[in-house]
C-alpha cells in the first residue's frame, strides 16, 4: 500500500507481550494532521478498528485499547491514517507491530550456564526447557523491545530445550523465556521465573543499547 501520506508510527504501551485477559494500548501517531486512524490486524482473526484522531501540538494520534486480551486479538498490527472519511484515503502503513498473548500454557524453566553470575567477558548461555512439547522458545530481556527466538531441540530426558548463547558477558540483566507452538506463533506460554544474570568486574549492571528502541516501540518481525 503506497498511501497518499507518509506512514504513521505505532507503539504498544506498556509493551507488545500481553498477558491473557489484560489490555494493551496501541498508539498510532503522526505529525500529519490525520482525522482518522485505522488499525488493521493480520493473524488468526483479521480485524480493522477505527478511531477519530486527537490533535495536540502538531501531532495527531489515536489510542486503541486492545483487550481483554485473547487469542483472536494477537497478531500483526499496522496503523493507517486518513485525512478524509468517506471515502478513506489511506496513508502508507506503519511498520508492523507483533502483539503476542502470553500466559496460555505452563511456564518453561530458565537456567544459565555456567551460572547466573559470570565474570566480565566470560561466555554465558541461557537454556529454556519444558516437559511441554514447545516448538519454539522466546527469550526476552527486561528493557529490550524484541525477543530472541530459537527452535526447541529434540526431546532429551523428557524435556524440550533451546539454548541461547549470549556470548561474552558485558552487562547483566533480567531474562524470561516463553514457549510457543509452530502453528500459533502469537500465542505464548506463561513466563518462566525471571533469571537475573549478574556480571562481576563490571561497574554497571545496566545494558546500554542506545541504538535499540524502548520496550514501547514496534518490535521487529520475528514470529514468522
Amino acid at each position: 500500500h503506497e498511501g497518499v501520506h507518509r506512514k504513521p508510527s505505532l507503539l504498544a504501551h506498556p509493551g507488545p507481550l500481553v498477558k491473557s485477559e489484560e489490555t494493551v494500548i496501541l498508539q498510532c501517531w503522526s505529525d500529519v494532521r490525520f482525522q482518522h486512524f485505522l488499525l488493521h490486524r493480520e493473524g488468526k482473526f483479521k480485524d480493522t478498528l477505527h478511531l477519530i484522531g486527537e490533535h495536540h501540538d502538531g501531532v495527531s494520534k489515536a489510542n486503541f485499547s486492545i483487550g481483554p486480551m485473547m487469542q483472536d486479538l494477537a497478531g500483526t498490527y499496522r496503523c493507517y491514517g486518513s485525512v478524509t472519511h468517506s471515502p478513506y484515503q489511506l496513508s502508507a502503513p506503519s511498520d508492523p507491530l507483533d502483539i503476542v498473548i502470553t500466559g496460555l500454557y505452563e511456564k518453561p524453566s530458565l537456567s544459565a550456564q555456567p551460572g547466573p553470575t559470570v565474570l566480565a567477558g566470560e561466555s554465558v548461555t541461557l537454556s529454556c526447557s519444558s516437559r511441554s512439547s514447545y516448538d519454539m522458545y522466546h527469550l526476552s530481556r527486561e528493557g529490550e523491545a524484541h525477543e530472541r527466538r530459537f527452535s526447541a531441540g529434540p526431546k532429551v530426558n523428557g524435556t524440550f530445550q533451546a539454548d541461547f548463547p549470549l556470548g561474552p558477558a558485558t552487562h547483566g540483566g533480567t531474562y524470561r523465556c516463553f514457549g510457543s507452538f509452530r502453528d500459533s506463533p502469537y500465542e505464548w506460554s506463561n513466563s518462566s521465573d525471571p533469571l537475573l544474570v549478574s556480571v562481576t568486574g563490571n561497574p554497571s549492571n545496566s545494558w546500554p543499547s542506545p541504538t535499540e528502541p524502548s520496550s514501547e516501540t514496534g518490535n521487529p518481525r520475528h514470529l514468522h
Epitope: E21, L38, H40, E42, K44, F45, K46, D47, T48, L49, H50, L51, F64, S65, I66, G67, P68, M70, Q71, D72, L73, H85, S86, P87, Y88, L90
Partner: antibody
Framework: QVQLVQSGAEVKKPGSSVKVSCKAS????????ISWVRQAPGQGLEWMGG????????NYAQKFQGRVTITADESTSTAYMELSSLRSEDTAVYYC?????????????????WGQGTTVTVSS | EIVLTQSPGTLSLSPGERATLSCRAS???????LAWYQQKPGRAPRLLIY???SRATGIPDRFSGSGSGTDFTLTISRLEPEDFAVYYC?????????FGQGTKLEIK
C-alpha cells in the same frame, strides 16, 4: 440510519452455488464489519464468517472454510456471500449483519444491524 | 469451539412477571464478548445486550445482562406482551463465534 438490504430468495440444486448480496446505505461501509449468519428452518443461528471491506480481509468459521467466499465491493457498498457445493442441509435463511462498532468495543462480533434475510432452498 | 447451552429450553410466564434466562459456556468467555438477542418469528434477530451487560441502543431498561466466566444471565424485570419471543446468547471472544440454541419465552 444504516440499513442492510439483501437480495431475493433463491432455489438451487444440490452441488451448485449461490451468491447472496447485502447492500448497505448510510454510514461508512468501508470500515464496517459485515458478517453472515444463517438459520436453518426451526433451528438456531450459525455464524459463517465476515469481512471488513476496506482491506478485503475475511474470516471464516472452520466449518465453512473452502466452501464459502465472502467479498465486498466498496464502490457499491455491497457485501457478498457465495456458498458452493450446496446440499440440502444448506437450506436456510441467510442474514448479513453489521458488527457493533463503538470506540469501547474491540471485537465487532455483536450484531446491531441485520438485513431482512434471504431464503435459500436447496432441492433436487 | 465454545459451546453455549441455554436453559430452560422453554419458559412459560405471564406479562408483568420476571424472566431469568441462563447461558452456560463450555469454556470461559470474557464478559466483554457476550451478547444477547431477541428474535420473533419471520424476523431478523435484534441485539439486546453486548459485553454481557451493556444495553444496545433503544433497548428498554427492563432488559439487563450479567455474569462472567462460564455463566451468564439475561433478566427481563417485568414482562411486556411484546417480550415473548426466542432469546439467543452469543460469544464473540473466540472464533468461530457461536450462539446458544435459544430459549423460547412463551405466554403462560
Amino acid at each position: 440510519q444504516v440499513q442492510l438490504v439483501q437480495s431475493g430468495a433463491e432455489v438451487k440444486k444440490p452441488g451448485s452455488s449461490v451468491k447472496v448480496s447485502c447492500k448497505a446505505s448510510g454510514g461508512t461501509f468501508s470500515s464496517y464489519a459485515i458478517s453472515w449468519v444463517r438459520q436453518a428452518p426451526g433451528q438456531g443461528l450459525e455464524w459463517m464468517g465476515g469481512i471488513i471491506p476496506i482491506f478485503g480481509t475475511a474470516n471464516y468459521a472452520q466449518k465453512f472454510q473452502g466452501r464459502v467466499t465472502i467479498t465486498a465491493d466498496e464502490s457499491t457498498s455491497t457485501a457478498y456471500m457465495e456458498l458452493s457445493s450446496l446440499r440440502s442441509e444448506d437450506t436456510a435463511v441467510y442474514y448479513c449483519a453489521r458488527g457493533l462498532d463503538t470506540p469501547n468495543v474491540v471485537v465487532k462480533g455483536a450484531f446491531d444491524i441485520w438485513g431482512q434475510g434471504t431464503t435459500v432452498t436447496v432441492s433436487s | 469451539e465454545i459451546v453455549l447451552t441455554q436453559s430452560p429450553g422453554t419458559l412459560s410466564l405471564s406479562p408483568g412477571e420476571r424472566a431469568t434466562l441462563s447461558c452456560r459456556a463450555s469454556q470461559s468467555v470474557s464478559s466483554s464478548y457476550l451478547a444477547w438477542y431477541q428474535q420473533k418469528p419471520g424476523r431478523a434477530p435484534r441485539l439486546l445486550i453486548y459485553g454481557a451487560s451493556s444495553r444496545a441502543t433503544g433497548i428498554p431498561d427492563r432488559f439487563s445482562g450479567s455474569g462472567s466466566g462460564t455463566d451468564f444471565t439475561l433478566t427481563i424485570s417485568r414482562l411486556e406482551p411484546e417480550d415473548f419471543a426466542v432469546y439467543y446468547c452469543q460469544q464473540y471472544g473466540s472464533s468461530p463465534w457461536t450462539f446458544g440454541q435459544g430459549t423460547k419465552l412463551e405466554i403462560k
